[in-house]
Interface confidence: medium
């Protein structure tokens, strides 16, 4: 089966630069196939931009001003590039590769999509940290005693832009868990966020993560942010000792003994 | 210029209860072009759901059902047993590929109809409270609760923010809701919540203990041997001097 | 910059699994095709395989049953196994990124490479 | 699949052009890449897409590609040009190495 990968969530630009979107094609080879672009601007009708065929020819749709968008394909990796000369605001859209994948059942044909990169164009400065920074919350004693499971809650803070995506997993495990997230919100000039995973009282000695893609997140990949196993038996700690790496470490314990 | 125009800009569906979005063309028959289904959920992932000739993404084609009204010029798509995986926005779209004349492989889109899903009607429940600590952070947990209005109050003399609550269905088909906020005084923070005329405490849900109000660690888990009374995280994270974890007890 | 610093055993035995890690540093493991390349003492490249960051694997069909390519995102590093190895398999393994745009044809980045001898 | 062949020597004096040819079936419908590497060092990358020079190369090399040759130019050669260059190009998903030429600065 096809599948499609757009490894930009989102792609940052100011006015007049150019933006070069990526796609990448599994499972099928891209030379003995199409791909499709097309974009979704807000409260606008997904349309249909510009294909580049097996053999390379390049359709563009009928409207579509020429020299806007390029497109090419790398056979080799199975890559193709949507390139956005000299952005302006009425490109702000989310950008979608697609194709056609045969199915099992001869002459059946499906279009899969790819997951959209979102084009952003900013006229800000800002500063140079805009990744996520995360904030981790523990299960309260209470709702491992009284519920017979814990809660686990990732706040993600001061990141630009709005695009994000949280999902959660257990060390060792690639299968994803079920968690619910409430609706990113602006604070100033950047973003907040935060998810939050329900695991029964057997799961609370497993190490949990919480996996987050970011445009800004350092060196490009998932920000991988550890829950630590919880010990049920354990109800408190002395809370005069915190618990941290050596001082020039960023990275800080804080052992909180309150009674919730 | 064709045009898929849907029914309805927005669909309430209640969890368990059949769905039937519907969407027409304007400007030519339908029955010359292929209808077909997509959902977008949140993270702008486009699922194929339908295609005419009986085509079904993979997991659809249990609880989905596509039809057409030739006579309507409209497209149909029945969700048989939403869930609250369903909710997201569905859109129509058509294409000639493979069928004769002048085809176009490119897919014309309708506008989308946001689905949203809503636990079917139950008996009233009320939602058990606990409040988790980060610092200055704060945030209240308010568990498997019906029906959905809500009040959630972080009680505090020093507020320094707080955020709107998310509200969200639970697995087991009731509410969740989760609000936050930052304080000076994280540490004397209580949550109350006002739910169905009833105000519901997190102190109602502390676990009571003995005198000291406190369970002390053991002899070999004491303080002076932190590898054993705390765990560090590996977080691979980079942030700065956030407070990165609390063991809230 | 992105560095690739490659780590892993020189001395190895005939029929045993050959296992080299190149860690990615200064730079994103993220978008990238990364790769395996060995060069056999006075001989020429041969290329060995790549994998996306993302999972997606190639390999050269000469290597393909014996070869595996991993990457550890968490990590920033890129693993290669090569199963049953036998005296023709001494030679110096590089690993190596190909670049991006147009630079997606080419080898743009390489590990200072790690000598691999197989001898019983 | 597609094999790239070299000449194993080239030789030329300082201040001379040098050209290094590959050659292959329909390498011009391909994109060629030419690497150099010096003893005990990794390869470093000199031309790609047929003609272009990565940044930190110098403009004395040069590439070009059409029929079923490429061809790696070095002009004014200098003794620090002295190493083996490869050629490499894709066929189809596979990479492609030629086999090497071996540039002797006299």
């Known amino acids: 089966a096809g599948h499609l990968e757009q490894p930009q969530i989102s792609s940052t630009k100011t006015l007049s630069k150019t933006a070069r979107l990526e796609c990448v094609v599994s499972g099928i080879t891209i030379s003995a196939t199409s791909v499709y672009w097309y974009r979704e601007r807000p409260g606008e009708v997904i349309q249909f931009l510009v294909s580049i065929s097996y053999d390379g020819t390049v359709r563009k749709e009928s409207g579509i001003p020429s020299g806007k968008f390029e497109v090419d394909r790398i056979p080799e990796t199975s890559t193709s590039t949507l390139t956005i000369h000299n952005v302006e605001k009425q490109d702000i859209a989310t950008y979608y590769c697609a194709l056609w994948e045969a199915q099992q059942e001869l002459g059946k044909k499906i279009k899969v999509f790819g997951p959209g990169t979102k084009l952003i164009i900013t006229d800000k400065q800002l500063d140079a940290d805009v990744s996520p920074k995360p904030t981790i919350f523990l299960p309260s004693i209470a709702e491992t005693k009284l519920q017979k499971a814990g809660t686990y809650l990732c706040l993600l803070e001061k990141f630009f832009p709005d695009v994000i995506k949280i999902h959660w997993q257990e060390k060792k495990s690639n299968t994803i868990l079920g968690s619910q997230e409430g609706n990113t919100m602006k604070t100033n000039d950047t973003y907040m966020k935060f998810s939050w995973l329900t695991v029964p009282e057997k799961s609370l000695d497993k190490e949990h993560r919480c996996i987050v893609r970011h445009e800004n997140n350092k060196n490009g990949v998932d920000q991988e942010i550890i829950f630590p196993p919880i010990k049920t038996d354990v109800i408190t700690m002395d809370p005069k000792d915190n618990c941290s790496k050596d001082a020039n470490d960023t990275l800080l314990l804080q052992l909180t003994n309150t009674s919730a | 210029a064709i045009e898929l125009v849907p029914e309805h800009q927005t669909v309430p569906v209640s969890i368990g209860v059949p769905a039937t979005l519907r969407c027409s063309m304007k400007g030519e028959a339908i029955g010359n072009y292929y209808i077909n289904w997509y959902r977008k959920t949140q993270g702008n992932t486009m699922t194929f759901i339908y295609r005419e000739k009986d085509i079904y993404g993979p997991g659809f084609k249990d609880n989905f059902q596509g039809d057409i009204d030739i006579a309507k010029n409209l497209a149909v798509l029945k969700i048989l047993a939403p869930s609250e995986r369903d909710e997201g926005s569905y859109y129509c779209a058509c294409d000639t590929l493979g069928m004769g004349g002048e085809y176009t492989d490119k897919l014309i889109f309708g506008k989308g109809t946001r689905v949203t899903v809503e636990p079917r009607s139950q008996p009233h429940t009320k939602p058990s409270v606990f409040v988790m600590k980060n610092g200055t952070n704060v945030a209240c947990l308010v568990k498997e609760f019906y029906p959905k209005d809500i009040r959630i109050n972080l009680v505090s003399s020093k507020k320094i923010t707080e955020f709107d609550p998310a509200i969200v269905i639970s697995p087991s088909g009731k509410y969740n809701a989760v609000k936050l906020g930052k304080y000076e005084d994280s540490n004397s923070v209580t949550c109350s919540v006002q739910h169905d005329n009833k105000t519901v405490h997190s102190t109602d849900f502390e676990v009571k203990t003995d005198s000291t109000d406190h369970v002390k660690p053991k002899e070999t888990e004491n303080t002076k041997q932190p590898s054993k009374s705390c765990h560090k995280p590996k977080a691979i994270v980079h942030t700065e001097k956030v407070n990165m974890m609390s063991l809230t007890v | 910059q992105v560095q690739l610093v490659q780590s892993g055993p020189g001395l190895m035995k005939p029929s045993e699994t050959l296992s080299l890690t190149c860690t990615v540093s200064n730079g994103s493991i993220s978008g990238y095709f990364w790769n395996w390349i060995r060069q056999p003492p006075g001989k020429g490249l041969e290329w060995i395989g790549y994998i996306f960051y993302s999972g997606s694997t190639n390999y050269n069909p000469s290597l393909k049953s014996r070869v595996t390519i991993s990457v550890d995102t968490s990590k920033n590093l890129v693993s290669l196994k090569l199963n049953s190895v036998t005296a023709a398999d001494t030679a110096v393994y590089f690993c190596?990124?190909?670049?991006?745009?147009?630079?997606?044809?080419?080898?743009?980045?390489w590990g200072q490479g790690t000598m691999v001898t197989v001898s019983s | 699949s597609s094999e790239l062949t070299q000449p194993p020597s080239v030789s030329v004096s300082p201040g001379q052009t040098a050209s290094i040819t590959c050659s292959g079936d329909?390498?011009?419908?391909?994109?060629a890449c030419w690497y150099q590497q010096k003893p005990g060092q990794s390869p470093v990358l000199v031309i790609y897409q047929d003609s272009k020079r990565p940044s930190g190369i110098p403009e004395r090399f040069s590439g070009s590609n059409s029929g079923n040759t490429a061809t790696l130019t070095i002009s004014g050669t200098q003794a620090m040009d002295e190493a083996d260059y490869y050629c490499?190009?894709?066929?189809?998903?596979?990479?492609?190495f030629g086999g090497g030429t071996k540039l002797t600065v006299l």
């Open positions: 329909k390498l011009g419908d391909k994109y």
């Open positions: 490499q190009a894709w066929d189809s998903s596979t990479v492609v």
């Open positions: 190596a990124k190909l670049g991006k745009w147009e630079l997606r044809t080419a080898f743009d980045i």
